[in-house]
């Protein structure tokens, strides 16, 4: 039975040019965690935190992708295209795999603030 | 054109070490992580580690990690891998394969590298 | 370590006709299994990753699927050029493991 909840940053904006952290939390479980994948809006890879064999970032990224802190993934660089939802998939033992979704806003305005607060999606 | 060019066919006496190296071009070396897998004659493959050549981290197979050392030289875009403590066992074909774009699996392999350990 | 095993060991299919490789896993790893096929004298060459995703300028007379620990690689028509040992190998642990293979010659 899968007791678990994925707790994410909810809904955040970054400045365009500027880096933003994405960060899912999995609770209310003893599972263990073998691997976190990193999608983007299109479900397309951005990174693979596993285990036991560290970090894959997908090489179109790899020079704006950084691993963590932690499980997370830290995105630098921002354009507008970035803006949309990002998902990251929990794959656990004995549980099974949790989903949590986070979406990203990126804004020209100088205002644009990273809201760094989590939430149940 | 994705190449990965190995170093030549080396035969070495028990308890001494090789180094193998692998030449990459056609693609943004530091880019795609680099994988070492073996084949000893008539066996399936053995998967023996990986690096990042950007940052120069890497994980072993917990069988050979005391024995194997990955490293890469970024400015020529090439990765080695050294075996120390040589056995008649380590006798097989090395290769390097570069890592795919969705994950830990290869999709470029080198033409590989014959080590024959005999006294 | 996660352990691969294949069936058959070999098989010898007719020109034209299926050929079927089945490859079970020792522990689920969801869909996270490539194939390979390796010629004699030759390096192996990808097939397919992620249980069911072609890999470039692979013919569409392959094809995978499965997931969890039950495996298959599918040849529709088999050619002359596929007489070759396939292998399956996970791609979600340490140790990256490999099956130990199933020969496909021409019957």
């Known amino acids: 039975m899968m007791t678990g909840t994925i707790e994410t940053t909810g809904n955040i904006s970054a400045k365009k040019g500027g880096s933003v952290i994405l960060q899912c939390h999995l609770s209310s479980t003893m599972a263990q965690v073998t691997q976190v994948n990193w999608e983007q809006h299109d479900h397309s890879l951005l990174a693979i935190r596993n285990a036991e064999l560290g970090w894959h970032i997908y090489p179109a990224f790899k020079d704006r992708v950084a691993p963590g802190p932690g499980l997370g993934l830290t995105l630098q660089s921002l354009t507008m295209n970035d803006t949309g939802e990002y998902f990251c998939t929990y794959h656990t033992y004995p549980d099974g795999t949790y989903r949590g979704r986070i979406f990203l806003e990126v804004l020209e305005s100088s205002v644009a603030e990273h809201s760094a607060r989590f939430q149940i999606p | 054109e994705v190449q990965l060019v190995q170093s030549g066919a080396e035969v070495k006496k028990p308890g001494a070490s090789v180094k193998v190296s692998c030449k990459a071009s056609g693609y943004t070396f530091t880019n795609y992580y680099m994988h070492w897998v073996r084949q000893a004659p008539g066996q399936r493959l053995e998967w023996m580690g990986r690096i990042d050549p950007d940052s120069g981290g890497s994980k072993y197979n917990e069988k050979f990690k005391s024995r194997v050392t990955i490293t890469v030289d970024k400015l020529s875009s090439t990765a080695y891998m050294e075996l120390s403590s040589l056995r008649s066992e380590d006798t097989a074909v090395y290769y390097c394969?570069?890592?795919?774009?969705?994950?830990?699996?290869?999709?470029?392999w080198g033409q590989g590298t014959t080590v024959t350990v005999s006294s | 370590d996660i352990v691969m095993t294949q069936s058959p060991d070999s098989l010898a299919v007719s020109l034209g006709e299926r050929a079927t490789i089945n490859c079970r896993v020792s522990?689920?790893?969801?869909?996270?299994l490539a194939w390979y096929q390796q010629k004699p004298g030759q390096s192996p060459k990808l097939l397919v990753y992620n249980a069911k995703t072609l890999a470039e300028g692979v013919p569409d007379r392959f094809s995978g699927s499965g997931s969890g620990t039950d495996f298959t690689l599918t040849i529709s028509s088999l050619q002359a050029e596929d007489v070759a040992v396939y292998y399956c190998?996970?791609?979600?642990?340490?140790?990256?493991?490999f099956g130990p293979g199933t020969k496909v010659d021409i019957k």
């Open positions: 522990e689920n790893i969801y869909s996270y």
């Open positions: 190998q996970h791609h979600y642990g340490n140790p990256l493991t």
């Open positions: 394969a570069r890592e795919g774009h969705y994950g830990f699996y290869s999709d470029y």
